[in-house]
Interface confidence: medium
């Protein structure tokens, strides 16, 4: 059960435990799915910078390196918690708010209606 | 520049613009490179329920629908924010905490080293 | 030479009607996903509309919220042309209207996505002027 206000603590305490640095950082090139990233900056935001994953093609690489076109590259989406400066510009004082950002790519076969 | 302490109005504002309720839903079960959704819960965090994607195969299911081991199914992880309870159990004291999840799979060519 | 062409932009007053044409060249439009988009002045591209291709699904038809109900897009296989008909127009429909094509089918979950992010698309028209105005 949570308060409506509260008071937090932006010192970040980092509970990754991951120690390999580059994690999912070359997946968006050697996708079959492939993506490009998007900085999305804005100041009155926290985290202030985000990036946001834009699939290259609507179908998928195939082993050959050519474009499949009877599946879809599809943008896999997760909502995420950041803080906005409320009121606008205040130093010290935020909201908590929803964003749904683009994670990266997956390949699907897609969902076709045929004509009869 | 972010003060070290912060108030923080837990009323979440949704900027979600987008009405399409499935979103990326079934994608993992239609994806090459499927996954199975775990719940994680921790009443001392908040959100104090996030989902986990853990890959169904090493490889990624091809045309015929078998699974293709000479590619493989990858986790697409991504860094987010949640809040902490501090100390344990405390009601409105918290801190940012920076945690990865994994939010989908996608198929990669990988990465081989051939023996010379 | 592979190009699409735009035409039928106009000036015309708030409730009046256009149909915009886009007219493939160099390559056929029924393996392709159609779609328009359109940049008013100072603002972000968007997408309006998009159809899918024909050869391999049902050339279904998608729109933004915003144009629901107003726009129809739909093609013409003989003449490799797809037609964006505009109702109802309102003052914000003002933009500059591009048509673009990419090759494939196209899943229905992913038509809103092509519409605002639209990939990396494999041809682009250069736009026809759309002017709402009394």
């Known amino acids: 059960n949570f308060p409506r206000t509260v008071m937090v603590n932006l010192n970040i305490h980092n509970r990754n435990t991951n120690t390999n640095p580059k994690r999912s950082s070359d997946y968006y090139d050697r996708s079959t799915s492939p993506w490009n990233l998007h900085r999305n900056e804005d100041p009155e935001r926290y985290p202030s910078v985000i990036w946001e994953a834009k699939c290259r093609h609507l179908g998928c690489i195939n082993a050959d390196g050519n474009v499949d076109y009877h599946m879809n590259s599809v943008p896999i989406q997760q909502e995420i918690l950041v803080l906005r400066r409320e009121p606008p510009h205040s130093p010290n004082s935020f909201r908590l708010e929803k964003i749904l950002v683009s994670v990266g790519c997956t390949c699907v076969t897609p969902i076709v209606h045929h004509v009869a | 520049n972010f003060p070290r302490t912060v108030m923080v109005n837990l009323n979440i504002h949704n900027r979600n613009t987008n009405t399409n309720p499935k979103r990326s839903s079934d994608y993992y079960d239609r994806s090459t490179s499927p996954w199975n959704l775990h719940r994680n819960e921790d009443p001392e965090r908040y959100p104090s329920v996030i989902w986990e994607a853990k890959c169904r195969h090493l490889g990624c299911i091809n045309a015929d629908g078998n699974v293709d081991y000479h590619m493989n199914s990858v986790p697409i992880q991504q860094e987010i924010l949640v809040l902490r309870r501090e100390p344990p159990h405390s009601p409105n004291s918290f801190r940012l905490e920076k945690i990865l999840v994994s939010v989908g799979c996608t198929c990669v060519t990988p990465i081989v080293h051939h023996v010379a | 030479q592979v190009q699409l062409v735009e035409s039928g932009g106009d000036l015309v007053q708030p409730g009046g009607s256009l149909r915009l044409s886009c007219a493939a060249s160099?390559?056929?439009?029924?393996?392709?996903?159609i779609g328009w988009f359109r940049q008013a002045p100072g603002k972000e591209r968007e997408g309006v509309a998009c159809?899918?291709?024909?050869?391999?699904?049902?050339?279904?038809?998608y729109y933004v919220d915003s144009v629901k109900g107003r726009f129809t897009i739909s093609r013409d296989n003989a003449k490799n042309t797809v037609y964006l008909q505009m109702n109802s127009l309102k003052l914000e429909d003002t933009a500059v209207y591009y048509c673009?094509?990419?090759?494939?089918?196209?899943?229905?979950?992913?038509?809103?996505?092509?519409?605002?992010?639209?990939?990396?698309?494999?041809?682009w028209g250069n736009g026809t002027l759309v002017t709402v105005s009394s």
């Open positions: 673009a094509a990419e090759r494939g089918r196209i899943d229905p979950d992913v038509a809103g996505y092509f519409l605002r992010e639209s990939y990396v698309m494999d041809y």
């Open positions: 160099g390559f056929t439009l029924d393996d392709y996903v």
């Open positions: 159809i899918s291709s024909i050869s391999n699904s049902d050339g279904r038809a």
